[in-house]
């Protein structure tokens, strides 16, 4: 039978290549059974994940899955880095894998490079 544990569907070592100035939605797909858990986003600073407070977040409901969305309006160079979502369920914390945002500043790039170029050219990225 289907597990009724909360599950967070962010792939390990996943990444998104995005551009400063653009809007972007970072989604945390959440599977749950009866009661939707409380979900938060944090940003990794070394080994510590710092909770993101006061940010625009929202929920999107699909047939078998809910999505907890972190909105970037717009993306800033400082948004570069790794993010993780966490669900609080029955007083247990379930953490997702981290996903990395590679932010390119369009002012410093003469033309928009491809996603794979961005992921493999760290000198284009902000730390």
């Amino acid at each position: 039978k289907e597990s009724c544990d909360v599950q967070l569907y962010i792939k390990r070592q996943s990444y998104h290549s995005i551009f400063a100035g653009d809007p972007f939605k970072l989604e945390c797909p959440v599977k749950y059974c009866a009661h939707r858990p409380q979900v938060t986003w944090c940003k990794l600073n070394g080994t510590t994940c710092v909770k993101l407070e006061g940010r625009h977040t929202s929920w999107k409901q699909e047939k078998n899955l809910s999505f907890f969305i972190l909105h970037f309006e717009p993306v800033l160079p400082s948004d570069n880095g790794s993010y993780r979502c966490s669900a609080n369920f029955l007083s247990a914390i379930i953490e997702s894998h981290s996903t990395t945002l590679y932010v390119t500043d369009v002012k410093s790039a003469s033309e928009r490079p491809s996603k794979d170029e961005m992921a493999s050219r760290p000198w284009l990225l902000y730390s």
Partner: antibody
Framework: EVQLVESGGGLVQPGRSLRLSCTTS????????IHWFRQAPGKGLEWVGR????????KYTASFKGRATISADGSKSIAYLQMNSLKTEDTAVYYC????????????WGQGTLVTVSS | DIQMTQSPSSLSASVGDRVTITCRSS???????????LNWLQQKPGKAPKRLIY???KLDSGVPSRFSGSGSGTDFTLTISSLQPEDFATYYC?????????FGQGTKLEIK
């Protein structure tokens, strides 16, 4: 039933290109990473690279970068490996494999397809 | 790139024997989520590899319990507690913690 079936192998001349296909069934390809590996005759296994069928993001071993392109069509549940400027040293059995991306819950391999690069 | 060194490269053993294969990585395979992404594969002649063990010690579905994995950091072990005739094959460790993913050179397990 889970299946990964590679096709497109065969004899190819040096300098030419080849596209291998990996047709999958029995699972949602978008929940996985599709990897390509190869194994030269009598040798060990080598990782070529991987593709995320959910968004097209790819990673490669440095020696394949620029010469190999891994892609996937999530709607058809098919992945591809395009190899350009083939050399005799590229002669190998090429395998695709599908590894669940969230919790490592499965790692399925295809049966492999032999590519022979020779004039 | 991370080097994966397996030992021994070949091994002769008899049915019923306990066998241990080791795999050493040139740097820690501990990811920032606290897990080590170290896998063991079995390959029989003319066949595709099959995943036996993932995350150091988790057995794949359908893999007999005589197989076990252990280790941490840079040193890992595959143990077969009582060899069966179908276990004679080549075994590979491979890491998918760090890009590019890399393999050990393989250990060929032969019948004595």
């Amino acid at each position: 039933e889970v299946q990964l079936v590679e096709s497109g192998g065969g004899l190819v001349q040096p300098g030419r290109s080849l596209r291998l296909s990996c047709t999958t069934s029995g699972f949602n390809i978008k929940d996985t990473y599709i990897h390509w590996f190869r194994q030269a005759p009598g040798k060990g296994l080598e990782w070529v690279g991987r593709n995320d069928p959910a968004n097209g993001n790819t990673k490669y071993t440095a020696s394949f970068k620029g010469r190999a392109t891994i892609s996937a069509d999530g709607s058809k549940s098919i992945a591809y490996l395009q190899m350009n400027s083939l050399k005799t040293e590229d002669t190998a059995v090429y395998y695709c494999a599908s590894y669940e991306g969230y919790y490592e819950r499965f790692g399925y391999w295809g049966q492999g397809t032999l590519v022979t690069v020779s004039s | 790139d991370i080097q994966m060194t397996q030992s021994p490269s070949s091994l002769s053993a008899s049915v019923g024997d306990r066998v241990t294969i080791t795999c050493r990585s040139s740097q820690s395979l501990l990811d920032r989520d606290g897990k080590s992404y170290l896998n063991w594969l079995q390959q029989k002649p003319g066949k595709a590899p099959k995943r036996l063990i993932y995350l150091v010690s988790k057995l794949d579905s359908g893999v007999p319990s005589r197989f076990s994995g252990s280790g941490s950091g840079t040193d890992f072990t595959l143990t077969i507690s009582s060899l069966q005739p179908e276990d004679f094959a080549t075994y590979y460790c491979w890491q998918d913690t760090h890009f590019p993913y890399t393999f050990g050179q393989g250990t060929k397990l032969e019948i004595k």
